[in-house]
Interface confidence: medium
Amino acid sequence: EVTLLDSRSVQGELGWIASPLEGGWEEVSIMDEKNTPIRTYQVCNVMEPSQNNWLRTDWITREGAQRVYIEIKFTLRDCNSLPGVMGTCKETFNLYYYESDNDKERFIRENQFVKIDTIAADESFTQVDIGDRIMKLNTEIRDVGPLSKKGFYLAFQDVGACIALVSVRVFYKKA
């Protein structure tokens, strides 16, 4: 496997693009069991209807790979675990990509992204102790291809869930 992006290995802030800028996805640092900071993206606007919060990665080179794999480690709150939550609360989010030769795209319209899948928390998870909390870490892997442009952007769409993205890794398999 060749890793093209690993959010856990980025030093400092990830600085991905959130839309809207305020009130949607937030970059939040948490400490793992070794007291090492993990940069996560969180959103939890479960009380308000019609949520449409987008988070876009930086440009990811495909390095000639025709098919890439996206591994997402995330936690998703059960709507029933949150007090006062109505039918506005969701338990899924959506994963998209957009191919581009331009590594500095500033504005990408929502309708330019291609949907990869709707992601839900399954029954299997890894339990991680992070000091004052227990994280139930789900891992989902999706693949995309064939790719033809020099690189691509990933996007995560929240529609009203309570999510923390803990790590995003993009890789391809060497022949």
Epitope: E22, E26, V28, C44, N45, R77, P83, M135, V166
Partner: nanobody, 118 residues
Framework: QVQLQESGGGLVQPGGSLRLSCAAS????????MYWVRQAPGKGLEWVST????????NYADSVKGRFIISRDNAKNTVYLQMNSLKPEDTAVYYC???????????WGQGTQVTVSS
């Protein structure tokens, strides 16, 4: 040791104002969303308001919208609830609740009594 300590409750006349505070300690406050919920006498818990980790997003129950304002100061590990134009039906014990987007446990305060009466 994790603690959430509410203060600022009391007896107020209809139309009056109160400011509730909830001081947090023992956990990474800035990583947590904060709720205010309330429990009126003989009733269940009712959600009042939520603020996200950075303070940029706030939500309110219809019953308090336009009258209550939630805010937070991450430097002081404190969340506030400014309650204006209070009504008798706002009488309740008010609790603050800290929760993270993707993990537990959630933390609760002991509550502060708000009584609106003439």
């Amino acid at each position: 040791q994790v603690q959430l300590q509410e203060s600022g409750g009391g007896l107020v006349q209809p139309g009056g104002s109160l400011r509730l505070s909830c001081a947090a300690s023992g956990f990474t406050f800035s990583s947590y969303y904060m709720y205010w919920v309330r429990q009126a006498p003989g009733k269940g818990l009712e959600w009042v308001s939520t603020i996200n980790t950075g303070g940029g997003s706030t939500n309110y129950a219809d019953s308090v919208k336009g009258r209550f304002i939630i805010s937070r100061d991450n430097a002081k590990n404190t969340v506030y609830l400014q309650m204006n134009s209070l009504k008798p039906e706002d009488t309740a014990v008010y609790y603050c609740n800290a929760f993270a987007a993707g993990w537990g446990p959630d933390y609760w305060g002991q509550g502060t009594q708000v009584t609106v009466s003439s």
